[in-house]
Amino acid sequence: PRSIEVKYIGVKSAYVSYDAEKRTIYLNITNTLNITNNNYYSVEVENITAQVQFSKTVIGKARLNNITNIGPLDMKQIDYTVPTVIAEEMSYMYDFCTLLSIKVHNIVLMMQVTVTTAYFGHSEQISQERYQYVDCGRNTTYQLAQSEYLNVLQPQQ
């Protein structure tokens, strides 16, 4: 079998809401993945599991099942959304994200994603980790090329 390539492209959008009373930030983060099938047969994307970390704390998890089938030598772009909550011991971030004196409220999040593919009864898992800047102060839609530049895509050290 040839390789199945997973490329994390970046954050597509981040939608934010707040609970002032609880000093809580809710961020719905939509990410984009490219999955390339370099084989001469179809592969099934069984599931995608994702989690988001802020300051080494997991703030959101998501799992997508039975996603799609990728044909021979084909590529598919998949969007997935991770709902995240920044609260409790990180509630000081409410002050940062709602600060009126600054325009862009970028925070650094670690995006982790694992793609499980299947072909001929065989399963394969491919994982990626990237740090991303996300604006927690407003709803933001990123151009993907811009997102790669903005989000300083680098593997975890």
Epitope: E88, D95, F96, V152
Partner: antibody, heavy 117, light 107 residues
Framework: QVQLQQSGAELVKPGASVKMSCKAS????????IEWMKQSHGKGLEWIGN????????KYNEKFKGKATLTVDKSSSTVYLDLSRLTSDDSAVYYC??????????WGQGTSVTVSS | DIQMTQSPASLSVSVGETVTITCRAS??????LGWYQQKQGESPQLLVF???NLADGVPSRFSGSGSGTQYSLKINSLQSEDFGTYYC?????????FGGGTRLEIK
């Protein structure tokens, strides 16, 4: 307004211990971590450790493990720094500060510790 | 531990001039950087947080920039009250560390 009030100067003998305080006011005490720094005379700043009153999470710089201990009295919104087995190298000004994302936004006035026989 | 290399160590500048102080991190700190001013006998004061954001009450002649491992603090049209020592500090991974400081003297 936010204030961090530190205890007064200390003159202590080598081998002894000292406990200094940092009393927070003007904000919800449990929301922000409190950081501690050391500044030796005419020198730069060193981070000692931090304490988060929300969950009592304490982190230390390896260099100060066994030397520094952070404790809290939540009823008075006060964080304490205890320094043990003092030597002349511990003579310095010790600052507490409030953590904010990407910087420490409020600082105490500092506590001067002099170790001398 | 992440090392913060600050330069220059000292400089002497006339009122009205522009000054830039730089800080280099030994690895990517993702804009988790603060700049502080400290005057003789006083506590440090936050000038810039998260690399680019001006703290409350800080004059607009101060500005922070940079990303990755390279950061700078710029002071436009230097005033006499700007003398003192400036420190950068990363807050990316524990232990937080400070730069060695830049002593700014007014000519």
């Amino acid at each position: 307004q936010v204030q961090l009030q530190q205890s007064g100067a200390e003159l202590v003998k080598p081998g002894a211990s000292v406990k200094m305080s940092c009393k927070a006011s003007g904000y919800t005490f449990t929301t922000f971590p409190i950081e501690w720094m050391k500044q030796s005379h005419g020198k730069g700043l060193e981070w000692i450790g931090n304490f988060h009153p929300y969950n009592d999470d304490t982190k230390y710089n390896e260099k100060f493990k066994g030397k520094a201990t952070l404790t809290v009295d939540k009823s008075s919104s006060t964080v304490y720094l205890d320094l043990s087995r003092l030597t002349s190298d511990d003579s310095a000004v010790y600052y507490c500060a409030r953590y904010f994302y990407g910087g420490m936004d409020y600082w105490g006035q500092g506590t001067s510790v002099t170790v001398s026989s | 531990d992440i090392q913060m290399t600050q330069s220059p160590a000292s400089l002497s500048v006339s009122v009205g001039e522009t000054v830039t102080i730089t800080c280099r991190a030994s690895e990517n700190i993702y804009s988790s950087l603060g700049w502080y001013q400290q005057k003789q006998g006083e506590s440090p004061q936050l000038l810039v947080f998260a690399a680019t954001n001006l703290a409350d009450g800080v004059p607009s002649r101060f500005s922070g920039s940079g990303s990755g491992t390279q950061y700078s603090l710029k002071i436009n049209s230097l005033q006499s009250e700007d003398f003192g020592t400036y420190y950068c500090q990363h807050l990316w991974s524990i232990p937080w560390t400070f730069g060695g400081g830049t002593r700014l003297e007014i000519k």
